[in-house]
Amino acid sequence: RTTTCFGDGCQNTASRCKNGGTWDGLKCQCPNLYYGELCEEVVSSIDIGPPETISAQMELTVTVTSVKFTEELKNHSSQEFQEFKQTFTEQMNIVYSGIPEYVGVNITKLRLGSVVVEHDVLLRTKYTPEYKTVLDNATEVVKEKITKVTTQQIMINDICSDMMCFNTTGTQVQNITVTQYDPEEDCRKMAKEYGDYFVVEYRDQKPYCISPCEPGFSVSKNCNLGKCQMSLSGPQCLCVTTETHWYSGETCNQGTQKSLVYGHHHHHH
């Protein structure tokens, strides 16, 4: 945020940039949290725009019985590994085809035991406040589907009649990692020493990090004709004086007519 300065007073202004603002020869360049000619004002809204998508990664192990393990499968650049990867990926794409959050699989390791496949199932969803629930549900469906396929697609008389066959008991979910996005935490951190006074409110499922000085939200402070200003002790209303009235009170809702004061009478609206 920048405020431009013209004229002789500019050099003076340079040494007076506040709150970590820096002079660039024309104006004070203010850090994210501040604005104003001298960076003296605290912003009322901080952009904590969420990521467009949130990801989850499930570490799974399955045992493929329709392929016999060979040493070449350890080498990720071998023809054997590449072919196995292609078939396994196609098979898993079929298994998880009904899960909208499913992105794909990534084989991390193949080892002996028929072929034990250590792999990640990758999930992704559009950010909404309910993303945790969406991804939790998706991971449950992944577990159900992989359990089902490894129970159904099994070798009969030493031959597999499916794209791949599995050992029913070789299916394990090792770990589930969900990308953490905590708008409240981000908001508090970015508001720094004003963190106690900034809150997250949602509009169209998008989080907004705002102080009570930002109008139009449920926590917004109504300063009436005054101006809301943030200080280290919280939001305060700076009341104005017009030609006819002085305004006072916590929300500048008390107007005193100047003529009455000059006539030694007080009158409150």
């Epitope: 392929v67 016999k68 054997e80 078939t87 031959i159 009649s161 794209m163 791949m164």
Partner: nanobody, 123 residues
């Protein structure tokens, strides 16, 4: 690029025999697997027989005891000896190969294919 070429198809009477051959462009599959599939008119492709580099062989129930799969690694060739042929054996026969030591007779498990050779069993 891997190439597989089948030969040996033709017209044969019920009860007769036929030997199919498949020539691979190199010996790439000597450490993997090779197989025969067939596709009758209007039907899905189905597995017939499989042989792996470890010597293991497997057959579809419908051909067990009648067909024999074998390979000659020195000649990079695969064979299918078909005896006691029946009308229902009529189909296009395909050779398939894999770098993997497979135990699967599902066409989706196989990545490399020949163009096929026609076998007609009819009197």
């Amino acid at each position: 690029d891997v190439q597989l070429v089948e030969s040996g198809g033709g017209l044969v009477q019920p009860g007769g025999s036929l030997r199919l051959s498949c020539a691979a462009s190199d010996n790439t599959f000597s450490r993997g697997s090779m197989s025969w599939f067939r596709q009758a008119p209007g039907k899905e492709r189905e597995g017939v027989a499989i042989i792996s580099s470890d010597g293991w062989t497997g057959y579809a129930d419908s051909v067990k005891g009648r067909f024999t799969i074998s390979q000659d690694n020195a000649k990079n060739s695969l064979y299918l000896q078909m005896n006691s042929l029946r009308a229902e054996d009529t189909a296009v026969y395909y050779c398939a190969a894999s770098f993997l030591v497979l135990r699967a007779l599902n066409p989706k498990a196989w990545h490399y294919w020949g163009q096929g050779t026609m076998v007609t069993v009819s009197s």
